[in-house]
């Protein structure tokens, strides 16, 4: 029986151009975490394997950094980064636990300010 629960940062927002840390935490189980996958919709962003360490998908290498811990740092955010992110914990012997985070990337106040006061 799966007794564990995943706590996540829930719904979060960040400014365009900035960075954000995606964090999940598995609790209430003795199961051993063997791998954590980070996914955005159906795209694999990164894998942290207990033995092999981190692997970042090539298409995200420039903007994704491993950590802290089993978390993931997204950098140079764009509005297109808005959406659902999933942490998928592979555990022995419980199986898979999944956490969901919704990220909204907002136009930065600097960008808005610049847009309003453009020099013609």
């Amino acid at each position: 029986m799966m007794t564990g629960t995943i706590e996540t940062t829930g719904n979060i927002s960040a400014e365009k151009g900035g960075s954000i840390i995606l964090q999940c935490h598995l609790s209430s189980t003795t199961a051993q975490v063997t791998q954590v996958n980070w996914e955005q919709q159906d795209q694999l962003l990164a894998i942290c394997n207990a033995d092999l360490g981190w692997h970042i998908s090539p298409s995200f290498k420039d903007r994704v950094a491993p950590g802290p811990g089993l978390g993931l740092t997204l950098q140079s955010l764009t509005v297109n980064d808005t959406g659902e992110y999933f942490c998928i914990y592979h555990t022995y012997p419980d199986g898979t636990y999944t956490g969901r985070i919704f990220l909204e990337v907002l136009e930065s106040s600097v960008a808005e300010h610049g847009a309003r006061f453009q020099i013609p």
Partner: antibody, heavy 120, light 107 residues
Framework: QVQLVQSGSELKKPGASVKVSCKAS????????MNWVRQAPGRGLEWMGW????????AYAQDFTERFVFSLDTSVTTAYLQISSLKAEDTAVYYC?????????????WGQGTLVTVSS | DIQLTQSPSFLSASVGDRVTITCRAS??????LAWYQQKPGKAPRVLIY???TLQSGVPSRFSGSESGTEFTLTISSLQPEDLATYYC?????????FGQGTKVEIK
């Protein structure tokens, strides 16, 4: 190369205790869950339970909750199985086995087995 | 707990025969099933994991298949060195129990 080397055969009297060791080498012990499996003479394999090598937390199968203790000494990369108040029916070969941490689990390396004989 | 029922418990076949061993789970276990071979006096070794994946170094005459809650280990052409007992094991949740075993004898 990965190896699990177990301690030698034991002959014990009923009521005594025994401690079986499983020395892991060729990999990082704390990254892979460790299991214990019992095989009584002429019988099949029984999964006794496992130990979370990352946290040291053990979990026991239903028939092995009373007199059986799994432990670890990470400084010497060794897992232990202790059985107290030995009974004749504890006579068996005991195996340690590592859980492979692919996304679909299996026991990829096994110790050679330790025969524990309980006889007056 | 989910039960595994392995059949047959014993089989005798000739060298070159195709041999099939079945393992039924009482509930769905996805592909969390492994097959092991244990030769007399030796520790078990994994043959198949994830129901169908052949372990590195295992001869290709061994294969695994699944259909719902029924899993099959097939030896396409039995060899003298295949004399052993074969076990299935579920690994989807605690307890990671084994089937009762199938002893394969060479005629």
């Amino acid at each position: 190369q990965v190896q699990l080397v177990q301690s030698g055969s034991e002959l014990k009297k009923p009521g005594a205790s025994v401690k079986v060791s499983c020395k892991a080498s060729g990999y990082t012990l704390t990254n892979y869950p460790m299991n214990w499996v019992r095989q009584a003479p002429g019988r099949g394999l029984e999964w006794m339970g496992w130990i979370n090598t990352n946290t040291g937390s053990p979990a026991y199968a239903q028939d092995f909750t009373e007199r059986f203790v799994f432990s670890l000494d990470t400084s010497v990369t060794t897992a232990y199985l202790q059985i107290s108040s030995l009974k004749a029916e504890d006579t068996a070969v005991y195996y340690c086995a590592r859980t492979a941490i692919t996304s679909v689990y299996h026991f990829d390396y096994w110790g050679q087995g330790t025969l524990v004989t309980v006889s007056s | 707990d989910i039960q595994l029922t392995q059949s047959p418990s014993f089989l005798s076949a000739s060298v070159g025969d195709r041999v099939t061993i079945t393992c039924r789970a009482s509930q769905g276990i996805s592909s969390y099933l492994a097959w092991y071979q244990q030769k007399p006096g030796k520790a078990p070794r994994v043959l198949i994991y994830g129901a169908t994946t052949l372990q590195s170094g295992v001869p290709s005459r061994f294969s695994g298949s699944e259909s719902g809650t029924e899993f099959t280990l097939t030896i396409s052409s039995l060899q003298p060195e295949d004399l052993a007992t074969y076990y299935c094991q579920k690994l989807n949740s605690h307890p990671c129990s084994f089937g009762q075993g199938t002893k394969v004898e060479i005629k």
